[in-house]
């Protein structure tokens, strides 16, 4: 804080505000009868320079003029942009102990004249909004700079408003607080911005506009949709708009979509009919407005209207499959399965399925409704049966899908040939086959069916299947395919009244099994040893097991073990070997092999055959 200048004065030439790069002379003068009391000639005036309250320089060596004991003039140069404080102090040199006494001080501001403001842009939000203009001020001036926004228009009227920039606030936008009304639509307005500070002034180029150029309509509001006769595909979108709007843009999309449907509507007057909506679909609707067909700006998009279109009766055909199991000599269990319709086919919430099983000749019909995607019934083994399923929502039911119940694997001549399963990547398997060689009736379609080879999978899990046209001989299966799991894959060839099938195992990715089979027993029968084992637990198989290996060697031998390789069959859990010597103790163990390699060995068992073995 500078004390009130009791001892003297400080003046600046040419002025306390100077352009960057200019020099200034600072004069410090003592008032009469002020100074060092005993020895006026010992008065020494010193000038200190402060930036941000920090002393940065003693300008003792910059004196250009000195009236000893009365006044001194200092020249200051290379001042940086912004404000610098100079304090003049009196140093009574005969008294070393007393600090210099402040006389007076002055602030010098260094800056630049304002550049002409550029890029003026004005907007009025809505017919009842007010005009606000923004501009680019150019380089920072480092001085308080006043900006005047001036708008001239019809009726010889000019309005203006002011703001200023300094080191605390920036002025590059002003709201004039005035409204241009539609009756001025044809009028031209001129706006300019003038900048003034202590070092000069400058004016922007005039910027001309019309009402239509700057008025941005308010976005439409109160959006709603009315579905004609509860239709799921036709609706009238309605909204409120400002009175002068002549053009609207509508955009709408299903909520999970990534691209909008766009529609332009002229003179819509807050109403537009949409005819291509998808039933029972969550949609988002937005509207924008414009005041002129060719000129002017679009409003912001309105707030979204989110709504679901009404249901319509399902369309499309259910994909049905079935399984047959004989229960006894005159009864069989039929399990029907079907895939849910996709949303565009279901066109609503599926409430239930109508299932019909019909014996063609005797006209026996079993009917039921279910909410599930499977249905099981026990029926006689005799007769020709057909099944149909349709899906129902609140508006109606789909056309029933029919399938003939045939013995799926009953006709060897219809069995596809050379079925193979190759892993394509982590989550799919390519199945290929050749058509049946001597089919006596035409193949109508192929069904590729698969299920995980895990305990209980037949009862716990429905099958997965793909329908393949008769001229295709391959299928890429991916639904519910996981790596390191073995699947039983069946390819069915179906004619009108018969079926044939071939089976193969496949996996999408494999590793060597975690462990080998566990030998549970070794028994001797008729000069042969029977090795019994338990299969490797399902999670440890890590793919399809191709074969098992039984190893044996004499107990203390260092020779390579002998081995016997057995083709893997899920149903098999014992195997005979006959090349062991009697009364010799052997160590036996087993391993399992997948396409990726061999497992570690399972448990070791010792056995000494008793009888004659050759």
């Amino acid at each position: 804080n500078i004390d009130v200048c009791k001892l003297g004065t400080v003046t600046v030439q040419p002025a306390p505000v100077i352009p960057l790069g200019s020099a200034a002379n600072i004069s410090c003068s003592l008032n009469p009868k002020q100074g060092c009391s005993h020895y006026p000639s010992s008065n020494e005036l010193i000038l200190l320079k402060f930036v941000n309250d920090v002393l940065v320089e003693n300008l003792h060596g910059k004196k250009v003029h000195d009236h000893t004991g009365h006044s001194s003039t200092f020249q200051v140069t290379n001042l940086s942009l912004g404000m610098t404080l100079f304090v003049c102090k009196l140093n009574c040199s005969n008294s070393q102990k007393k600090p210099p006494v402040p006389v007076c001080g002055v602030e010098i501001s260094v800056g630049v004249a304002p550049e002409p403001p550029q890029n003026i842009s004005c907007v009025q939000e809505g017919e009842n909004g007010t005009v606000a203009c923004s501009w680019n001020s150019g380089k920072v001036t480092y001085l308080k700079t006043n900006y005047t926004l001036q708008l001239s228009g019809p009726n010889n009227l000019t309005c203006q408003k002011q703001c200023f920039s300094d080191n605390r606030q920036n002025c590059n936008r002003l709201d004039l607080g005035i409204n241009l009304s539609p009756d001025l639509a044809e009028s031209r307005f001129i706006v300019r911005v003038t900048a003034i500070n202590d070092l000069g002034n400058s004016s922007s180029l005039p910027h001309t506009f019309t009402f239509l150029d700057i008025v941005i309509p308010l976005p439409p509001w109160d959006i709603r949709i009315n579905f004609l006769n509860a239709s799921g595909s036709r609706g009238t979108l309605q909204w409120e708009d400002e009175g002068q709007v002549v053009l609207n843009q509508l955009r709408y999309q299903p909520l999970n979509s990534t691209s909008w449907n766009m529609v332009n509507a002229t003179n819509a007057k807050g109403k537009y009919d949409l005819r291509d909506l998808r039933p029972f679909t969550e949609y988002e609707f937005q509207i924008s407005s414009k005041l002129h067909l060719s000129g002017g700006s679009w409003s912001n998009w309105s707030e979204s209207l989110r709504t679901r279109t009404p249901e319509e009766e399902p369309v499309g055909i259910l994909d049905i499959w079935y399984m047959k199991q004989d229960i006894d000599y005159d009864r069989q269990q039929i399990s029907l399965f079907w895939k849910s319709l996709n949303p565009s086919e279901a066109r609503g919430k599926i409430l239930h399925y109508q299932v019909t099983l019909q014996e063609v000749t005797k006209k026996t019909t079993l009917q039921n409704t279910t909410r599930h995607t499977s249905w099981t019934r026990v029926i006689p083994r005799t007769g020709a049966w057909t099944a149909s399923v349709s899906a129902a929502n609140s508006k109606g039911a789909s056309a029933p899908t029919h399938i003939n119940i045939v013995d799926l694997c009953g006709t060897g001549l219809l069995a596809p040939h050379q079925v193979s399963a190759k892993s394509e990547n982590m989550d799919n398997i390519l199945v290929t086959w050749q058509p049946p060689k001597k089919a006596d009736s035409a193949v109508r379609e192929y069904i590729v069916e698969w299920r995980a080879l895990q305990p209980g999978s037949i009862t716990k899990f429905p099958p997965h299947w793909l329908r393949i046209p008769p001229d295709n001989m391959s299928a890429l299966i991916s639904e519910n395919i996981k790596p390191y799991i073995c699947y039983e894959i069946r390819v069915h060839a179906l004619s009108e009244s018969q079926g044939g099938c071939s089976s193969i195992r496949g996996d999408s990715k494999h590793k060597a099994p975690v462990s080998g089979p566990h030998i549970t027993a070794i028994t001797e029968k008729k000069e042969r040893l029977f090795i019994s084992w338990t299969h490797i637990p399902f999670p440890e198989q890590r793919g399809c097991i191709l074969h098992y290996r039984i190893y044996w060697k004499e107990r203390d031998s260092t020779a390579q073990p002998e081995l016997c390789e057995i083709q893997y069959r899920r149903s098999q859990n014992s195997h005979p070997i006959s090349s062991l010597q009697p009364r010799v103790t052997y160590v036996l163990w087993m391993t399992a092999v997948t396409a990726a390699g061999e497992s570690p060995q399972g448990n070791e068992r010792e056995f000494c055959p008793q009888g004659k073995a050759n």
Epitope: L157, C159, K161, L176, I178, D183
Partner: nanobody, 129 residues
Framework: QVQLQESGGGLVQAGGSLRLSCAAS????????MAWFRQAPGTEREFVAG?????????FYDNSVMGRFTISRDSAKNTMWLQINNLKPEDTAVYYC?????????????????????WGQGTQVTVSS
């Protein structure tokens, strides 16, 4: 009772300056629109300058006086001024102070006499050549 009282008029030589004052009493107009009109003999009363009354006060001027006239107000004192520089003989007229009881937002309404609810008696300005 609302009263607007103008003062500061007089006889001035061309090129001179005047500062007209309008003091309002009976009501606060600090946030509302105020304006100066003038009427020369045998002519209609015409708009000279105005203040919109909206936040920050936008000033309006007839193009004929733009740059020479400056309108301002002191809300605390309920007073409005018109600084007139470089007076011309055609500035000779009775100058009236007018006040509205609302903010004037519409560009088109600022210069209309019907926009303003209260008027002063006027102060004579005569410019001699």
């Amino acid at each position: 009772q609302v009263q607007l009282q103008e003062s500061g008029g007089g006889l001035v030589q061309a090129g001179g300056s005047l500062r007209l004052s309008c003091a309002a009493s009976g009501r606060t107009f600090s946030n509302y629109a105020m304006a100066w009109f003038r009427q020369a003999p045998g002519t209609e009363r015409e708009f000279v300058a105005g203040l919109s009354g909206s936040g920050g006060d936008t000033a309006f001027y007839d193009n004929s006086v733009m740059g020479r006239f400056t309108i301002s107000r002191d809300s605390a004192k309920n007073t409005m001024w018109l600084q007139i520089n470089n007076l011309k003989p055609e500035d000779t007229a009775v100058y009236y102070c007018a006040a509205a009881t609302h903010v004037v937002v519409s560009y088109g309404l600022v210069r209309r006499r019907g926009t303003y609810d209260y008027w002063g008696q006027g102060t004579q300005v005569t410019v001699s050549s």
